[in-house]
């Protein structure tokens, strides 16, 4: 009995469907076919879960996260028991093993890994304004994400007709924060930060409003 | 207390220009964003224009870009919208707006002036 | 750009009901905003940032969600109450409005 080589890893975004490769050669009658896929979950590693099983002739369910949303991909018994997860969640990342029985073929590789990664797009980020915003104060224009795999890079643009940041703004992608030095009139204006990875994107605006010193009144 | 005052209603010919004025008091204007909004015979609301406190910032969408221009004059405490190449499409209320706080929405409105696009 | 669908259309509630109105982006926005809009007046500020009442908005209101999906709610309606209300967001550019909600009173 020998599992063939899996595509290593398989990256699906939160939701959609996911399918598990797992295909194997046996010299024998699938009459005493036993599979068993096995989780090793990213979140709780050392805490394998069982996924689904075919045992007997009959199929049995894993783990209660599993159920309703798991089963193999083709009618049992079969060379390929590659399985679907529908509705995939972040708690499905992990490591998957299918280990294959079929006796009397013993011997040979028979276990197949394949690894998942359920990504997720960057929810809505909250954007926010550190510091005063008199003119000549400094300003830090904050803008992260509760969620997103891979995490978020974020990119600060000005909402005017160059797009561009005024020229005394530094900008950190990863952490999300525009520094504007020295506020001017100029510096006022919407500012959209876009939070991006693989698979999407979103924004959040933020209107700054650089405030004049107002003339005083004599008399 | 907060006032803004639109004025410059009118019917237009397809085409044609007009440009509306917004008296605000009661608030520094210099201290605060503007923009102007639109509420279609339909009652749909639509943003036009928007301006950052100074007035060195301009933004739009993509449906006036080109055709209208907002300013103003924080001197005088008013906010303008000229309108140009108008359509059918542009007919509708249009009011003028101040932004309040950092979070972009329309803490405050006019009255409303009416501009009729029609030939 | 994005959508925002308001449901229901239109409501209709006896006084002392309580009744909720929701908004569904297309996508998903930081924050919502809520205006009032009475016949022949302009809309008036209501719930600004999700959840914040703008001023004089009574106590009755309140406003939540997060995501794609957000609500305003009147504990108890009242007779003034009656009304179209609007939900804005400007999270993503442009701006965006949504058809409104019209709450009638019996």
């Known amino acids: 009995l020998e599992v063939s080589e899996s595509p290593g890893s398989i990256q699906v975004a939160r939701g959609q469907p996911a399918v598990l490769p797992c295909t194997f050669t046996t010299s024998a009658a699938l009459i005493n076919l036993n599979v068993i896929w096995m989780v090793t979950p990213l979140s709780n590693a050392n805490q394998p879960e069982q996924v689904i099983l075919y045992q007997g002739g009959q199929m049995f369910d894993g783990a209660p996260r599993f159920h309703g949303r798991v089963g193999f991909t083709g009618t049992m018994p079969a060379t390929n028991v590659s399985i679907f997860i529908n509705n995939t969640q972040l708690s499905d990342t992990g490591t998957y093993q299918c280990l294959v029985n079929n006796l009397p073929d013993i011997g040979g590789r028979n276990i197949g890994v394949t690894g998942l990664t359920v990504l997720v797009p960057p929810s809505a980020p909250h954007c926010q304004i550190q510091g005063s915003q008199d003119i000549g104060s400094d300003v830090i224009l904050l803008c992260s994400s509760e969620e997103g795999i891979p995490r978020p890079t974020y990119l600060w643009e000005k909402l005017d007709n160059t797009l561009k940041l005024p020229p005394t703004a530094t900008q950190d992608q990863v952490q999300g924060t525009v520094t504007i030095r020295n506020i001017s009139a100029l510096s006022s204006g919407l500012y959209q930060c876009v939070a991006s990875n693989a698979i999407g994107t979103s924004t959040c605006l933020l209107d700054l409003q650089v405030i004049s010193p107002q003339p005083r009144n004599i008399g | 207390e907060v006032k803004l005052v639109e004025s410059g209603r009118g019917l237009v010919q397809p085409g044609g220009s007009l440009k509306l004025s917004c008296a605000a008091s009661?608030?520094?204007?210099?201290?605060?964003?503007m923009s102007w909004v639109r509420q279609t015979p339909e009652k749909r609301l639509e943003w036009v224009a928007y301006?950052?406190?100074?007035?060195?910032?301009?933004y739009y969408p993509d449906t006036v870009k080109g055709r209208f221009t907002i300013s103003r004059d924080n001197a005088k405490n008013t906010l303008y919208l000229q309108m140009s190449s108008l359509k059918s499409e542009d007919t509708a209320m249009y009011y003028c707006?101040?932004?309040?706080?950092?979070?972009?929405?329309?803490?405050?409105w006019g009255q409303g002036t009416l501009v009729t696009v029609s030939a | 750009q994005i959508v925002l669908s308001q449901s229901p259309a239109i409501l209709s509630a006896s006084p002392g009901e309580k009744v909720t109105m929701t908004c569904r982006a297309s996508?998903?926005?930081?924050?919502m905003h809520w205006y009032q809009q009475k016949p022949g007046s302009s809309p008036k500020p209501w719930i600004y940032?999700?959840?914040n009442l703008a001023s004089g908005v009574p106590a009755r209101f309140s406003g939540s969600g997060s995501g794609t999906s957000y609500s305003l709610t009147i504990s108890r309606v009242e007779a003034e109450d009656a009304a179209t209300y609007y939900c804005?967001?400007?999270?993503?550019?442009?701006?965006?409005f949504g058809r409104g909600t019209k709450l009638e009173i019996k």
């Open positions: 707006a101040r932004h309040d706080g950092n979070y972009p929405w329309f803490a405050y």
């Open positions: 009661g608030f520094t204007f210099s201290s605060y964003s």
């Open positions: 301006i950052s406190n100074g007035g060195g910032s301009t």
């Open positions: 996508s998903s926005v930081s924050y």
């Open positions: 940032a999700t959840s």
């Open positions: 804005q967001q400007w999270s993503s550019d442009p701006p965006t």
